[in-house]
Every structure is written in structure tokens, then in C-alpha cells.
């Protein structure tokens, strides 16, 4: 998180990290944590940890350790040969079904999804939280979790900024309707690190509660605006996918 | 397995360039970060600087900000040195090496390059 | 940039004796509640090996009988008791600033 404050996980207690690659998650419920495409395409069994402000090795030896079951990408995910050439990350969502249930507690519980209805519409301007252990200004992984207060912004906003590295020709770069653009304020913004985390919105409809509006996916370069992906246009997926392949007890 | 395979020496003349090679097996480079050291002939470490190979983000040492450019390849996997203008200063070895995870060490290290640097 | 002193440059320890390393850096390597202070172990024709981070923190997989402890800008190395392959240089390293740096080794013979 570029811009960022020190952030303490019971403030965000949905809050997951994955350790290879260095990235984020959110629990959505106990058994199933959903992330970004390109933080699980590589690594089908990701090791995972929950409630714990600090991943430094010898803390999260002591914090709680999710195992996954299966790991689910969504079908429009477009898998490449060489994934270091991306340019489309439409699509950039995963769910992560658990082998176990994950016990609730003050530093661990959900996030919710998006509701269907058009409360659930982002307005440029609307404020989300972002978290994670990616690179910061000082650092380039954080041992503790960093947080920010981000406005959406327009997609062109993201257009506009030009590619850090391009492994490719700039118009080559997808912009859809799947993803959301916010940043640009302060050079508040996450980078390396901090895929597949939450962008965090308030409950229009319950204020003691936030929603994953996006989850941390790409952006043409850290501390300018950043590309999240919009999980209200995914939430009958991810019913599916959770209806699916849920266990009998769990319905 | 984590294995950073480090190119073989070389013997170059003054004045000259020389660019080592550092190939990863076992971890994606673009996953993380590589950074290299520079140890001479019975002396000291010293750190030259490093590179995000997913956005080519690099840091250096003051001292070393003109001598060394660190570049990568995700494709290949391999992380570079180049080295410039070289004296009998650079005659060293030079190490590339993993950033660490949930700890800000060198977790991995290549076996080294040695560099010559003679007339 | 952060200068690190090591102390002895070289001492000779007896088999199953203590090896104590200081090192002391011209600032304070501490940041966040964490000491950015690590530990190496380099043999002859090898690559460093990383033994302690974070001033105290055992590496997975190095022996109990190493140790290290310290915060701000005073640092030590224990090895207790030393054995035959623990001749070698060791090295302290601070990551908390820009640009990492290192000390200038202590050699560590066993008598």
C-alpha cells in the first residue's frame, strides 16, 4: 500500500494473506475466501493466513492457517503461456473453497459481497478501504498491514496514466466495465503485494458493515491510480461456485 | 526447489562492459525481487542495489548508480548485472540474491560470479 | 548510509566454548517495533547464509545453539556451544534503510 498507515487486522478482520505469492484475499464466509484470478493461476494450493496484524515469518508461525480445498478461477479468465505478458486482466477473480471452517473471532470474520440492487452502483468519488502487505514508499513487502481511504474514479483516469513497465504496446492494455478505477488522491494507491485484497465500501444499507466492492487486481503504476475488480458484476458466480460446491451441512 | 544459477567467470580489460546473468528455478522473479552483492577479494559484502522485475523498479547504492544497471527478463526467469567502465575495482565477486519472505533478508543466494578485470 | 561495526575482526574459540559478535550501527536499524538487524554465516568459497533476522529470529533450519539479540543500534551474535563447522565469517546486516548495508565480518576460528 503506497500511502498508506499502519492498519490493525481487527479493523479489517477479512483481511487474508497468501504467502506465495506475496498477496491478499478476503474471507467472505468460513468456508471460502475469494482473491484475484492472477494471484492463484500459478499456484493452486496457496497457503494462507488469517488475524494477524503481522506476517513476519516467525509471527505468523503463531497465526491461524487456512489449507484449501480446491481453487476456482473464474471461466473468463483468459490463462496465458508466459503470464508475465499480460495485458487483460478482465475477469481477475477467484474463489478459494477452505478444507476446514474457519473459526470467527475479533481479528477473523467476513466481509460481505455486493448486493443486486443499484445501492450497490459505485459513484466516482465513493470511498473504499484497501489492506494489504505489498510494497510500501519504505519498504517493498510490509511485515505489517497497511491501509488507505481511496476514491473511485473514473476508468479513464487509468487509461490516462502511462504504463510503468509496459511488456507490451500500451493500447494493447484491457479497460472494461468489470473493473474500477480509484485512486489518484494523496499517491495513496496499493501496488506489488496487495492483489487480491478488498476494496472495502461501506454498507449503503448497514453503516457497522463493508462490502467488496474490488479486489486489488493490476494498475499502470503504483502511487497513481489503481485497477480493481468489480465484484457486484461476479456475485451471481460466486453463489454458484459457493452452491456448487458446498458441503450438505453447510446449506 | 528455490535455486538462483549464477553465470560462469570472466576475465575482461579495462574500461571494458560485462553483463552477469542470474537464472531462477523454482519461483517466478516477477513474483519477487532480486538483488545483488559484491564481495572482493578477501573483504566484505557490499550491497549493489535491486530490481522488481514485474515493473523494472530498481534501487541502487550511491556508489554504485553509474557503475551498475540491474535489469530482468520475466520471460526467462533471469535477472542481469551490467557493469560499466570497469577497473580493478570491480575485480570481485558478485552474488545475486532473493529478497526474503516475512523477513527483510537474503533468503537465497546464487553460487557467485567472479569478475576479473585485467589488462 | 547506516555504518556497521563488527567486533573482535577475529576471535578463536574452544570447542563447545561461547562466541560472542557485536555489532554496532551508527543509527538505529529499528522501525515499526522491529529491529532490521540479520545475522550471516559465510564459509570459504560460499555464499552467505542467512542465520538470524530481525535481530533475534532463528532461521528455519539453523541450529538452536546460534542466537542473536539487541535493538536500536547495539547487536550480538551467541553461539554456544561452538562447534567444528562453525569456523567461518559471519556478517551483520541492517535492512531497515536505504542502501542495506553490511559489516565488516568477524572471523571466527576453533581452537
Known amino acids: 500500500i503506497i500511502g498508506g498507515s499502519d492498519a490493525d487486522i481487527k479493523n479489517f478482520p477479512w483481511q487474508v494473506f497468501f504467502d506465495n505469492p506475496w498477496a491478499g484475499g478476503a474471507l467472505i464466509n468460513e468456508y471460502w475466501v475469494l482473491t484475484a484470478a492472477h494471484v492463484v493461476e500459478g499456484n493452486r494450493e496457496p497457503t494462507m493466513y488469517v488475524g494477524s496484524t503481522s506476517v513476519q515469518t516467525s509471527r505468523l508461525a503463531k497465526s491461524k492457517m487456512l489449507t484449501p480445498e480446491h481453487v476456482f478461477i473464474h471461466p473468463g479468465w483468459k490463462l496465458l503461456e508466459v503470464p508475465e505478458g499480460r495485458t487483460n486482466f478482465d475477469n481477475d477473480i477467484a474463489l478459494v473453497r477452505l478444507k476446514d471452517p474457519v473459526k470467527m473471532g475479533p481479528t477473523v470474520s467476513p466481509i460481505c459481497l455486493p448486493g443486486t440492487s443499484s445501492d450497490y452502483n459505485l459513484m466516482d468519488g465513493d470511498l473504499g478501504l484497501i489492506s494489504g502487505w505489498g510494497r510500501t514508499e519504505k519498504r517493498d513487502r510490509a511485515v505489517r498491514l497497511k491501509a488507505a481511504r481511496l476514491p473511485v474514479a473514473p476508468l479513464r483516469k487509468c487509461k490516462e496514466v502511462k504504463v510503468e513497465k509496459p511488456t507490451a504496446d500500451a493500447e494493447a492494455y484491457v479497460f472494461t466495465p468489470n473493473m474500477i478505477c480509484a485512486g489518484g488522491e494523496k499517491g495513496m494507491d496499493s501496488c506489488k503485494g496487495d492483489s487480491g485484497g478488498a476494496f472495502a465500501v461501506q454498507d449503503p444499507n448497514d453503516k457497522t458493515k463493508f462490502y467488496a466492492a474490488g479486489l486489488v487486481s493490476w494498475g499502470p503504476q503504483c502511487g497513481t491510480y489503481g485497477l480493481y475488480t468489480r465484484v457486484k458484476n461476479y456475485v451471481d458466480w460466486i453463489m454458484k461456485t459457493m452452491q456448487e460446491n458446498s458441503t450438505p451441512r453447510e446449506d | 526447489e528455490v535455486k538462483l544459477q549464477q553465470s560462469g567467470a570472466e576475465l575482461v580489460r579495462p574500461g571494458a562492459s560485462v553483463k552477469l546473468s542470474c537464472t531462477a528455478s523454482g519461483f517466478n522473479i516477477k513474483d519477487d525481487y532480486i538483488h545483488w552483492v559484491k564481495q572482493r577479494p578477501e573483504q566484505g559484502l557490499e550491497w549493489i542495489g535491486r530490481i522488481d522485475p514485474a515493473d523494472g523498479h530498481t534501487k541502487y547504492a550511491p556508489k554504485f548508480q553509474v557503475k551498475a544497471t540491474i535489469t530482468a527478463d520475466t520471460s526467462s526467469n533471469t535477472a542481469y548485472l551490467q557493469l560499466s567502465s570497469l577497473t580493478s575495482e570491480d575485480t570481485a565477486v558478485y552474488y545475486c540474491?532473493?529478497?526474503?519472505?516475512?523477513?527483510?533478508?537474503?533468503?537465497?543466494w546464487g553460487q557467485g560470479t567472479t569478475l576479473t578485470v585485467s589488462s | 548510509d547506516i555504518v556497521l561495526t563488527q567486533s573482535p575482526a577475529s576471535l578463536a574459540v574452544s570447542l563447545g566454548q561461547r562466541a560472542t559478535i557485536s555489532c554496532k550501527a551508527s543509527q538505529s536499524v529499528d522501525y515499526d517495533g522491529d529491529s532490521y538487524m540479520n545475522w550471516y554465516q559465510q564459509k570459504t568459497g560460499q555464499p552467505p547464509k542467512i542465520l538470524i533476522y530481525?535481530?533475534?529470529n532463528l532461521e528455519s533450519g539453523i541450529p538452536a545453539r546460534f542466537s542473536g539479540s539487541g535493538s536500536g543500534t547495539d547487536f550480538t551474535l551467541n553461539i554456544h556451544p561452538v562447534e567444528e563447522e562453525d569456523a567461518a565469517i559471519y556478517y551483520c546486516?541492517?535492512?531497515?534503510?536505504?542502501?542495506?548495508?553490511f559489516g565488516g565480518g568477524t572471523k571466527l576460528e576453533i581452537k
Open positions: 546486516q541492517q535492512s531497515n534503510e536505504d542502501p542495506w548495508t
Open positions: 540474491a532473493r529478497y526474503g519472505y516475512g523477513r527483510e533478508v537474503f533468503d537465497y
Open positions: 530481525d535481530a533475534s
